[in-house]
Amino acid sequence: RQQWELQGDRRCQSQLERANLRPCEQHLMQKIQRDEDSYGRDPYSPSQDPYSPSQDPDRRDPYSPSPYDRRGAGSSQHQERCCNELNEFENNQRCMCEALQQIMENQSDRLQGRQQEQQFKRELRNLPQQCGLRAPQRCDLEVESGGRDRY
């Protein structure tokens, strides 16, 4: 392969290592949880916001909203941070695809239903467009063995 391709590979690899894709994972998972509760089955009891991850309100992780945020507020915060991260891949479509594949791989084991998996893939494919970025033309998001988890 040509030298510039190898350089491109290395550049993509270092971009992926630098990127923090957690906000993307959090945004997407909250979105499909929210959709599941709205349309997929009987809604869960609405006494607290069921759409943001549960946790200690004193946590300092800037990517995790308090469970007491208004419905969906945490998710839009994640989306904004996610778009900032994906913006780094704007000029490299192949690398953008690898970032999306990494997100899919990290979350695939969390998705134990066909519908949930398909919806996650749909939302993931739409993510660059939602961020006002160009989506990769061809990007295979299939995960063969159910994925490798990052805890």
Epitope: R22, M29, Q33, N106, R110, Q112, G113, R114, G146, Y151
Partner: antibody, heavy 118, light 111 residues
């Protein structure tokens, strides 16, 4: 109504085999991961095995690896667990369980009893 | 393997009074997606277990709002705001981060 019905339990001698069957109804069986969970007499719950909706990933608790084999036939809405080289400590109530799509055990069958004794 | 430890193992309760059960994991149950993979189940006498709370604090369909779940690091709590006679049974926490493992169970009975 979503329902899971287990069958195949019974009394078996140590070292012998048994196959449990679970039939699902009231939901799209081929859309969900399914699990087997067991409960020894008077004891707590123990996850035993899971199989993804498309069978690409099958997992087992360490104590049954190499002895138990989980499979499914989506055309028959059926889940199976073949249990070989059974031991007295495998004596338990075995429940078939439907995943909710996010790793939670949403629907449980009524269970089937397996007794391993000479 | 993640080990789940519940306390107390036995909980005598008075109807109308609050009750809480604790569960501790040997490691964080928070996934990179921000969710805590901790569920609560109840098994009533002679019945199969049923899901009460998923992902730390999300009440399952049909579960009364007197049940709530909370998370603080590796400590998880199931609270019943006002115990009713029908709440007696064995309560289990379960982690779903890496495969699945249950706590030993807490037997809730009327005083």
């Amino acid at each position: 109504e979503v329902q899971l019905v287990e069958s195949g339990g019974g009394v078996v001698q140590p070292g012998r085999s048994l196959t449990l069957t679970c039939v699902g109804s009231g939901f799209n069986f081929d859309d969900y991961t399914m699990h087997w969970v067991r409960q020894r007499p008077g004891k707590g719950l123990e996850w035993v095995s899971s199989i993804r909706y498309n069978s690409v990933r099958i997992e087992y608790v360490e104590s049954v690896k190499g002895r138990f084999t989980t499979s499914r036939d989506n055309a028959k809405n059926s889940l199976y667990m073949e249990m070989k080289s059974l031991r007295p400590e495998d004596t338990a109530f075995y429940y078939c369980v439907k995943d909710n799509g996010f790793r939670s055990f949403e629907i449980w069958g009524q269970g089937t009893m397996v007794i391993v004794s000479s | 393997e993640i080990v789940m430890t519940q306390s107390p193992l036995s909980l005598p309760v008075t109807p109308g009074e609050p009750a809480s059960i604790s569960c501790r994991s040997t490691q964080s149950l928070e996934h990179s997606n921000g969710y805590h993979y901790l569920d609560w189940y109840v098994q009533k006498a002679g019945q199969s277990p049923q899901l009460l709370i998923s992902l730390g604090s999300k009440r399952a369909s049909g579960v009364p709002d007197r049940f709530s779940g909370s998370v603080s690091g590796t400590d998880f709590t199931l609270k019943i705001s006002r115990v009713e006679a029908e709440d007696v049974g064995v309560y289990y926490c379960m982690q779903a981060l890496q495969t699945w493992t249950f706590g030993q169970g807490t037997k809730v009975e009327i005083k």
